[in-house]
């Protein structure tokens, strides 16, 4: 069971990143699915290595004081959402903006029907060029 | 099937990074090989988690306007080369240069004879000290 | 065999990061253990994908000239310690400090009784908020 999906620009104002089965994507079988273009949902309980990579372009003056944060989050049926992993990068002083990349990854137990998704502080800063931003998992 | 190879400084002017089976490297068996010191080639079709880490040292004034970009690329026999993953980091203002690290990783389907390699915008900026820059894969 | 442990603030002045089985941690079975809150020790020989993520907050003026470096290290019974992976990030000019994240990961052969741990140049700069700093491995 494995998946690798590709970032998709979105007009939605949500902080949850959007993904698509496009480009050189992976969706090994129907035991993992991309739901509503925003979350990877697994049918089987087990240990999964889950990862995300986010490239963004921001400028210190044009952004809030707070850093750019990417969060890998988990939603299991009947449970509260929780943050699995987070990474933070202070905005660049480069103009008009400076690109930076964040990589998240870790091993987590997922229940049947559990979904994982990626949140960022400012989705408008995310880079969607080929290979820059992606999200995936593999069952151990 | 797994491999982990270590960066090697090169006098070549190519943007493709050079690697060696040295230090604490891994080459599990002959189903994955390091070819010409530049690409990992697999003999078996399947899903692989492929990763690369690149540490580099650059300075904004001494570098081009463009960010430092590391790309994980795929070459399958008779197919076009393609970018699987990319990461970008704006150059530091630290002098003489500021170090930064990039990590790339994802799950991809590889065909028999497929090769993966790592491209960077400026190989002269890459750090080759112990553990700083490496490249590997594992078959799921 | 898999583990994922969560960073823990420590009053110790050691450069070795401290970890705990808390939050959404993983410890698949007793073939991998967290020892003294500082190292993951495996009982079985084999290939392991080992990873660490460290988020830190630093300021160029308040820090040494040297960059912030995170190192993934190996200690095998009767062998010298060795660095497996390192990543470096120059300190931010943001005030009071600028957050940055480092991700390390690679495939390594571990012997029975081998331990892996994470070293940083300045543990006081490490961010311990939910999901920011973690450490784990999985057996291939």
């Amino acid at each position: 069971i494995a998946a690798h999906v590709i970032s998709e620009a979105s007009s939605k104002t949500t902080s949850v990143l959007q993904w698509a089965e496009k480009g050189y994507y992976t969706m090994s079988n129907n035991l993992v699915t991309l739901e509503n273009g925003k979350q990877l949902t697994v049918k089987r309980q087990g240990l999964y290595y889950i990862y995300a990579q986010v490239t963004f372009c921001s400028n210190r003056e044009a952004s809030s004081q707070a850093p750019f944060i990417a969060s890998l989050c988990l939603k299991s049926p009947g449970r509260f959402e929780r943050i699995l992993l987070r990474a933070a990068n202070t905005h660049s002083s480069a103009k008009p903006c400076g690109q930076q990349s964040i990589h998240l990854g870790g091993v987590f137990e997922l229940q049947p029907g559990a979904s994982v998704f990626v949140n960022v502080t400012d989705p408008s800063q995310v880079s969607h060029g080929t290979g820059f931003t992606s999200f995936g998992l593999l069952k151990l | 099937i797994a491999a982990h190879v270590i960066s090697e400084a090169s006098s070549k002017t190519t943007s493709v990074l050079q690697w060696a089976e040295k230090g604490y490297y891994t080459m599990s068996n002959n189903l994955v090989t390091l070819e010409n010191g530049k690409q990992l080639t697999v003999k078996r079709q399947g899903l692989y988690y492929i990763y690369a880490q690149v540490t580099f040292c650059s300075n904004r004034e001494a570098s081009s306007q463009a960010p430092f970009i590391a790309s994980l690329c795929l070459k399958s026999p008779g197919r076009f080369e393609r970018i699987l993953l990319r990461a970008a980091n704006t150059h530091s203002s630290a002098k003489p240069c500021g170090q930064q690290s990039i990590h790339l990783g994802g799950v991809f389907e590889l065909q028999p004879g497929a090769s993966v390699f790592v491209n960077v915008t400026d190989p002269s900026q890459v750090s080759h000290g112990t553990g700083f820059t490496s490249f590997g894969l594992l078959k799921l | 065999i898999a583990a994922h442990v969560i960073s823990e603030a420590s009053s110790k002045t050691t450069s070795v990061l401290q970890w705990a089985e808390k939050g959404y941690y993983t410890m698949s079975n007793n073939l991998v253990t967290l020892e003294n809150g500082k190292q993951l020790t495996v009982k079985r020989q084999g290939l392991y994908y080992i990873y660490a993520q460290v988020t830190f907050c630093s300021n160029r003026e308040a820090s040494s000239q040297a960059p912030f470096i995170a190192s993934l290290c190996l200690k095998s019974p009767g062998r010298f310690e060795r660095i497996l992976l390192r990543a470096a990030n120059t300190h931010s000019s943001a005030k009071p400090c600028g957050q940055q994240s480092i991700h390390l990961g690679g495939v390594f052969e571990l012997q029975p009784g081998a331990s892996v741990f994470v070293n940083v140049t300045d543990p006081s700069q490490v961010s311990h908020g939910t999901g920011f700093t973690s450490f784990g491995l999985l057996k291939l």
Epitope: K22, G23, Y24, G129, T130 | S15, G78, R79, F80, E81 | -
Partner: antibody, heavy 119, light 107 residues
Framework: EVPLVESGGGLVQPGRSMKLSCVAS????????MAWVRQAPKKGLEWVAS????????YYGDSVKGRFTVSRDIAKSTLYLQMHSLKSEDTAIYYC?????????????WGQGVMVTVS | DIQMTQSPTSLSASLGETVSIECLAG??????LAWYQQKSGGSPQLLIY???RLQDGVPSRFSGSGSGTRYSLKISGMRPEDEADYFC?????????FGSGTKLELK
């Protein structure tokens, strides 16, 4: 709006050279492979050449290898085809096309085409 | 080079009729195949990719099927605007090759 517009065609004598251009708009040019495909009068389609994202890799059909060169200018979002030693059998409509980003690299956008007559 | 043999060379169909065009590859191309439509005086347009996936904006009366070396394009219910030349193409390996085309006319 057509995102690919070719120019530079016309009549040329055998053995001479000609350069075609294709200006792209509406997408990030460096994120896609680009290609030239031709169609001789009343004939089928023939792939001529393709070029990678930023131009580091080029690929050619057997009939033009060594005579034609594909290149691109990222800053100008322009694709080029430099044709040397032209032959009468190179007479065709030349289309600029974008490869999609799927594993198959299909042609998802085509220009209107430009006529090259070698006579 | 992978040879692509397309048939028939031409056919005519009545309004509402179902039409099939075949493409035979010289070797297994693992579904890495596209179908294009080219109307008179126009540029080719992508209809089907990956053997059976419909390109965005293409009417659902077009469908693709097949595997290995044999592929087909089906038009379920011929319409006047479907009068065109149709080409298959393999991108499994370069050099990329096209079928010789099928001219579809309205009866």
């Amino acid at each position: 709006e057509v995102p690919l517009v070719e120019s530079g065609g016309g009549l040329v004598q055998p053995g001479r050279s000609m350069k075609l251009s294709c200006v792209a708009s509406g997408f990030t040019f460096s994120d896609y492979y680009m290609a030239w495909v031709r169609q001789a009068p009343k004939k089928g389609l023939e792939w001529v050449a393709s070029i990678s994202y930023e131009g580091s890799s080029t690929y050619y059909g057997d009939s033009v290898k060594g005579r034609f060169t594909v290149s691109r200018d990222i800053a100008k979002s322009t694709l080029y085809l430099q044709m040397h030693s032209l032959k009468s059998e190179d007479t065709a409509i030349y289309y600029c096309a974008r490869h999609d980003d799927s594993p198959g690299y299909y042609f998802d956008y085509w220009g209107q085409g430009v006529m090259v007559t070698v006579s | 080079d992978i040879q692509m043999t397309q048939s028939p060379t031409s056919l005519s169909a009545s309004l509402g009729e179902t039409v099939s065009i075949e493409c035979l590859a010289g070797e297994d191309i693992s579904n890495v195949l596209a179908w294009y439509q080219q109307k008179s005086g126009g540029s080719p347009q992508l209809l089907i990719y990956a053997a059976n996936r419909l390109q965005d904006g293409v009417p659902s009366r077009f469908s693709g099927s097949g595997s290995g070396t044999r592929y087909s394009l089906k038009i379920s219910g011929m319409r006047p605007e479907d009068e065109a030349d149709y080409f298959c193409q393999q991108t499994f390996r370069y050099p990329l090759t096209f079928g010789s085309g099928t001219k579809l006319e309205l009866k």
